[in-house]
């Protein structure tokens, strides 16, 4: 049964011109009714009755989950990160078998010295978090490691992380060219083999607010869009006010349907309103107001 209970006596006229009587139910929305126990809950669009009220699925709301929300919560991560897989060759330390064992004192000491050296190298990069040695091997010591970068999420986060990875490449190239052995001795904290520096791989956090917005909007994906305010993304329909894409319904109410946003125009005591944006007013004739 698809019976509805009117909850409002407002008379609305659709932009096509026909008058419709409405509770706030979108008659074009496909509905499915959820029945739990003996309780015909009238929870539509996949909503379910929790014993007190309908629990609606995004993007629906209302007593019977019959209306479509104007905005959907999307939560970008607070921070985004990049991981660079690098290899450098340290020439000022000779490889010993103990370095293979990550729990050995030798490995811990090497890890500490290498981390200190890399902290110095990358000290001017605000996105730099640290290094993580993944493997040490012979030659003198070939150090396979990750350089970790992190930044606050902004719409331009990819550019920020891409720039940071470029600076990492420049700085590691510079230090491994400058800090080299002279007469079999190293005067720096660590010395390197210039030719042993390689960037194997770069992985950047993938977050697309548009994609999240479209997924959450489900069958309304074509009508929801992302707009930014204070660098924060908002997933909105044109019925959400205060954004560039907001639909102005003037003398009417914006409502989402599967064909997009439309204006339901009001009829007042003195005027009929019509038009796509309910901006065409027709005065009712022979009507007098007495104050």
């Amino acid at each position: 049964p698809l019976a509805t209970i009117p909850v409002s006596t407002t008379s609305l006229t659709s932009s096509e011109g026909s008058t419709i009587s409405t509770p706030s139910v979108d008659i074009s929305t496909p509905v499915t009714t959820s029945i739990v126990g003996d309780q015909c809950s009238r929870c539509k669009n996949g909503g379910f009755w929790d014993g007190l009220k309908c629990q609606c699925l995004t993007p629906y709301y209302g007593e019977s989950c019959e209306e479509v929300v104007n905005s959907i919560d999307i939560a970008p991560p607070e921070t985004v990160s990049a991981q660079m897989e690098l290899t450098v060759t340290v020439t000022s330390v000779k490889f010993t078998d103990e370095l293979k064992n990550h729990s050995s004192q030798e490995f811990r000491e090497f890890n500490k010295t290498f981390t200190e050296q890399m902290n110095i190298v990358y000290s001017g990069i605000p996105e730099y978090v640290g290094v993580n040695i993944t493997n040490l091997r012979l030659g003198s010591v070939v150090v396979e490691h990750d350089v970790l970068l992190r930044t606050k999420y902004t719409p331009e986060y990819k550019t920020a992380l891409d720039n940071a990875t470029e600076v990492v490449k420049q700085k590691i190239t510079k230090v491994t060219t400058e800090q080299i052995m002279t007469n079999d001795n190293c005067s720096a904290l660590m010395c390197f083999n210039t030719t042993g520096t390689q960037v194997q791989n770069i992985t950047v956090t993938q977050y697309d607010p548009v994609e999240e917005c479209r997924q959450k909007a489900e069958e309304y994906e074509d009508y929801f869009l992302v707009e930014y305010r204070d660098q924060k993304p908002y997933c909105i329909s044109p019925c959400e006010s205060g954004f560039n894409a907001s639909k102005n319904c003037n003398h009417g109410k914006c409502q989402m349907s599967q064909n997009g946003a439309r204006c339901l125009c009001v009829t007042t005591e003195t005027h009929w309103y019509s038009g796509e944006d309910c901006n065409q007013g027709t005065q009712k004739s022979h009507h007098h107001h007495h104050h």
């Epitope: 330390v93 490889f95 010295t113 005067s187 904290l189």
Partner: nanobody
């Protein structure tokens, strides 16, 4: 826990000799690198010499041919034989160690340090 104890410093005349010792406890004597550093009044700490587990040695240019570094793995000790001493050798001498086979006299590469012993070369 690694502990280093330096000794043997003193007052000596120019051209004289001294032998510094460094006793290491908790340090795997057959591994890593041991070194001598010095710091003259008002100057930066500088590397004097280091010796690796396999006996490989390296010296600062200013002491080459005059100083000899050696280690006794059985006694877990490090030595610095200093001959033909000069006034500019006056400094506090420190022994240092690393578990790694190092080829650097950069002080920051050595995590373990002994307290200093004072060497004064004066007539």
């Amino acid at each position: 826990d690694v502990q280093l104890q330096a000794s043997g410093g003193g007052l000596v005349q120019p051209g004289g000799s001294l032998r510094l010792s460094c006793a290491a406890s908790g340090f795997p004597s057959s591994r890593g690198t041991m070194a001598w550093f010095r710091q003259a009044p008002g100057k930066e700490r500088e590397g004097v010499a280091f010796i690796n587990s396999d006996g490989r040695t390296s010296y600062a240019e200013s002491v080459k041919g005059r100083f000899t570094i050696s280690r006794d793995n059985a006694l877990s000790s490090l030595y610095l034989q200093m001959n033909s001493l000069r006034a500019e050798d006056t400094a506090v001498y420190y022994c240092a160690a690393s578990l790694l086979y190092l080829m650097t006299v950069n002080a920051a590469a050595y995590p373990y340090w002994g307290q200093g012993t004072m060497v004064t070369v004066s007539s």
